[in-house]
């Protein structure tokens, strides 16, 4: 039951995280105009990964896409790539994890196969979360660098003619959404990996075999002391005889080519 809960929670947390990563990637507020020097501006600038916008106090907002690839800073391209990779990995991870969920039955899929899929999706979520966190952090670092550069040189000449105050940009809402979303995806991935350990059969239990020694009639069970006392790794004390109705957690696993433990 705990395994199912951990896996389900990991899936939900990752789903929220990936939705957040997608939202952050699409948002226009990656960087917003710093209003420290001019808190009463009638024109507010903000920028995203795909376009830059200007909101006038009249209510009119104008956005312009970055209709160039070669003219964009390499760092921005890198951030775009990281976010897209994060989304793609996360989406694949979600797809895999849906089939891996213990509460969903697909044919006669074995626990070991589900464990493999859970681990795969968990790793994908972790990498996806790391990509998002890395992307957002790279952008934030770029902002901090530019912020202090423009602070050091607040007044810059435009073509040597007009003196204009340089617009400084600070962290936008998308950065915080990205960090939180990346963190959630990462946590969801870790939870999936933890759930995978619980799904995987930790020990192979065989059907009871009777050995007939001369003069004695004693039945020996493989596993010796562990199997009969409930100590060791087999804490669930699974039934090792064949027959009777079983609960989901009691279903016996048999060795297969998918086993990796």
């Amino acid at each position: 039951m705990a395994v199912t809960a951990c896996q389900g929670l990991g899936f939900v947390v990752s789903l929220i995280g990936i939705a957040g990563i997608i939202a952050a990637t699409c948002m226009d507020q990656w960087s917003t105009q710093d209003l420290y020097n001019n808190p009463v501006t009638a024109v507010f600038n903000y920028q995203g990964l795909w376009r830059s916008c200007v909101r006038e106090s009249s209510g009119f907002t104008e956005c312009r896409g970055y209709f160039t690839l070669l003219g964009l800073p390499a760092m921005l391209q890198a951030v775009r790539a990281l976010m897209i990779v994060g989304i793609v990995l996360g989406a694949i991870g979600l797809l895999v994890s849906i089939f891996a969920l213990k509460c969903i039955r697909i044919g006669s899929m074995e626990d070991s196969a589900k464990a493999n899929m859970t681990l795969t999706s968990g790793i994908m979520f972790i990498v996806s979360g790391l990509c998002a966190i890395a992307g957002v952090s790279v952008f934030a670092n770029m902002l901090v660098t530019n912020f202090w550069m423009s602070t050091a040189n607040m007044y810059t000449g435009m073509g040597g003619m007009v003196q204009t105050v340089q617009t400084r940009y600070t962290f936008g809402a998308a950065l915080f959404v990205g960090w939180v979303a990346g963190g959630l995806t990462l946590i969801g991935g870790v939870m999936m990996c933890i759930a995978c350990r619980g799904l995987a059969p930790e020990e192979t239990n065989y059907k009871a075999v009777s050995y007939h020694a001369s003069g004695h009639s004693v039945a020996y069970k493989p596993g010796g002391f562990k199997a009969s006392t409930g100590f060791g790794s087999n804490t669930k004390n699974k039934k090792i005889y064949d027959g009777g109705a079983r609960t989901e957690d009691e279903v016996q696993s048999y060795p297969s080519k998918h086993d990796y433990v």
């Epitope: 501006t41 009638a42 024109v43 600038n45 200007v54 106090s57 009249s58 009119f60 104008e62 007009v162």
Partner: antibody, heavy 119, light 113 residues
Framework: DVQLVESGGGLVQPGGSLRLSCAAS????????MHWVRQAPGKGLEWVAY????????YYADTVKGRFTLSRDNPKNTLYLQMNSLRAEDTAVYYC????????????WGQGTTVTVSS | DVVLTQSPDSLAVSLGERATISCKSS????????????LTWYQQKPGQTPTLLIY???TRKSGVPDRFTGSGSGTDFTLTISSLQAEDVAVYYC?????????FGAGTKVEIK
Amino acid sequence: DVQLVESGGGLVQPGGSLRLSCAASGFTFSSFGMHWVRQAPGKGLEWVAYISSGSGSIYYADTVKGRFTLSRDNPKNTLYLQMNSLRAEDTAVYYCATSYYYGNALEYWGQGTTVTVSS
Amino acid sequence: DVVLTQSPDSLAVSLGERATISCKSSQSLFNVGNQKNYLTWYQQKPGQTPTLLIYWASTRKSGVPDRFTGSGSGTDFTLTISSLQAEDVAVYYCQNVYSYPLTFGAGTKVEIK
């Protein structure tokens, strides 16, 4: 058609109060920022105050700050300017205008209401 | 606060001649984000309310005759009436719409010589 109609002007003694109203029609009032601009007799235009569409941002000219209060009632499509501690130099025609256009430009103006501060 | 200095105070021009009004700002009105200058020009005819002529320093409002031209960037702006008509007799104001308070210039009175 966009219409802005000011009312509430009149003669008031120095130190007195007056409340101007601006009734808007012909556009989605709740979506646009609104301004008050005044013009003293024979003088130029002087911007007085601005209120954003949702009243989140309100700005005043230094000459009226602390004395004038700007508000709006979006369901009633009405803009208000509460003027307290009036001085002789506040005598002017008061126009309400809207930044309905691009570039923060004041596109639509009312006909104005006259405020006279005199003893 | 942004201070706008208009010159000349008044201008007398013959019909069909060019009228040029200058507006200088104490601060740049250029916005890097959209590469636009936040300066507006208004016309106020005698006994009438002001009307918008030009926004973004050089964009004519629809319906405004093309003899009115706005130019300039940063701190120096100009309104040009290429061929003055009788109906152009008015006071012209420039306005900073970049930062609050949205200050106006003192105005330039255009008359016929």
